[in-house]
């Protein structure tokens, strides 16, 4: 169905070979990427509210494609937020955490109360923060805490972990 | 071609520390997520740790066995990964394989032997 | 944690035979973003490490013999090899890297009969 306005091929924005995306605009792509969609001569990137499509051979594309594969981007997407380094303290972070499958979860009563329980915490060295992450599946429920998402979908347990309990009073948590 | 190299392992006593090292070539390092998995003789594979690649501020994951025992790290100019292993018990004997998954595949090292014995 | 159930534990063959080595895990490893499947089948000889079969529950990797197939996806997994030679026989596991930890199979000791 390439080119259907309804199917999994539609594009809402196509980026032309000869004007790759921006690191920028990369970045906003890795935040919001949920899911995409190998068509015929390109591939359809499905975000939060919108679409975005490349050529297939696009270096961009084959990045994005292989980012989502290894859940390295969209709701597992942490970056690297440089002007909030100075929320958390300089001391090395204490390694302590294992990510949890928490897939399995989907009811909104159920994912705050294991977002609120969780132990498990991934390490994350100074200068980072885990909140904020974006949800990876269209159909899955979400429920809002203070601002913030609480998802389930493939390795969900990493990504709504709340930072180190000793990463200081400032960092803020996924859940209040 | 794809080669994981590991290396530092040897015999060493009940709650002492060693370092061992993992030199990767062949793909693109820095968008790898790397993984460290042991295999005790005769037994199973177990999982033990996990880094993440730069953009996720290389945030680390471990099995509950090892947690606060051992400690994952990397260095993408150099290709390399480690994995400071302190307070080691006997239960951590085992052949310590670095691997690393890339949407090609996930490659292994030929692994590196770690002897935990008084 | 995903619980990967691999039967049978161990298969005792005639050469030219077709081997069937199933792998159930404990939940869908078929991942909406893409829709892949996170399994991977491995084989190990004694005193070697695991050498990568099939990645995405069915993609051979390269230099292996297309006599290793890999098929299923959700939580039914299983890796089918035709026509077993001799140096067939080694340990076979399955593992999930859907999510951490990464867990695997028991293993499937391929021997001959």
């Known amino acids: 169905n390439e080119g259907s306005v309804t199917g999994s091929c539609y594009c809402g924005k196509r980026i032309s070979s000869d004007s790759p995306p921006s690191v920028q605009f990369m970045n906003r792509l890795r935040k919001h990427l949920r899911a995409y969609h190998r068509c015929l001569y390109y591939t359809r990137f499905q975000l939060l509210s919108w679409s975005v499509c490349g050529g297939n051979k696009d270096p961009w594309v084959q990045e994005l494609m292989s980012c989502l594969d290894l859940k390295e981007c969209g709701h597992a997407y942490s970056g690297i937020v440089a002007h909030q380094k100075h929320l958390l303290p300089t001391s090395p972070p204490i390694s302590q955490a294992s990510e949890g499958a928490s897939s399995d979860i989907h009811t909104p009563a159920q994912m705050l109360l294991s977002t609120l329980q969780s132990t498990q915490r991934p390490t994350l060295p100074v200068g980072s923060l885990s909140s904020d992450k974006e949800l990876t599946r269209p159909n899955e429920t979400t429920i809002h805490t203070a601002g913030h998402s609480l998802a389930a979908g493939p390795e969900a347990g990493e990504n709504q972990k709340q930072p180190e309990k000793n990463a200081g009073p400032t960092a803020r948590t996924s859940a209040t | 071609a794809v080669q994981l190299v590991e290396s530092g392992g040897g015999l060493v006593q009940p709650k002492e520390s060693l370092k061992i090292s993992c030199a990767a070539s062949?793909?693109?390092?820095?968008?790898?997520?790397m993984n460290w998995v042991r295999q005790a003789p005769g037994k199973g594979l177990e999982w033990v740790a996990r880094?993440?690649?730069?953009?996720?501020?290389?945030?680390?994951f471990y099995a509950d066995s090892v947690k606060g025992r051992f400690t994952f790290s990397r260095d993408d100019s150099k290709s390399m990964v480690y994995l400071q292993m302190d307070n080691l018990k006997t239960e951590d004997t085992a052949m310590y394989y670095c691997t690393a998954w890339t949407t090609e595949g996930i490659y292994w090292g030929q692994g590196t032997l770690v002897t935990v014995s008084s | 944690d995903i619980v990967m159930t691999q039967s049978p534990s161990s298969l005792a063959v005639s050469a030219g035979e077709t081997v069937t080595i199933n792998c159930k895990s404990s939940?869908?490893?078929?991942?909406?973003?893409?829709?892949?499947?996170?399994l991977a089948w491995y084989q190990q000889k004694p005193g070697q490490s695991p050498k990568l079969l099939i990645y995405w529950a069915s993609t051979r990797q390269s230099g292996v013999p297309d006599r290793f197939i890999g098929s299923g996806s959700g939580t039914d997994f299983t890796l089918t090899i035709s026509s077993v030679q001799a140096e067939d026989l080694a340990i076979y596991y399955c593992q999930q890297y859907y999510d951490t930890p990464w867990t695997f199979g028991g293993g499937t000791k391929l021997e001959l009969k």
């Open positions: 939940q869908s490893l078929l991942y909406s973003g893409n829709q892949k499947n996170y």
């Open positions: 062949g793909f693109t390092f820095s968008n790898a997520v």
């Open positions: 880094i993440r690649t730069k953009p996720n501020n290389y945030a680390t």
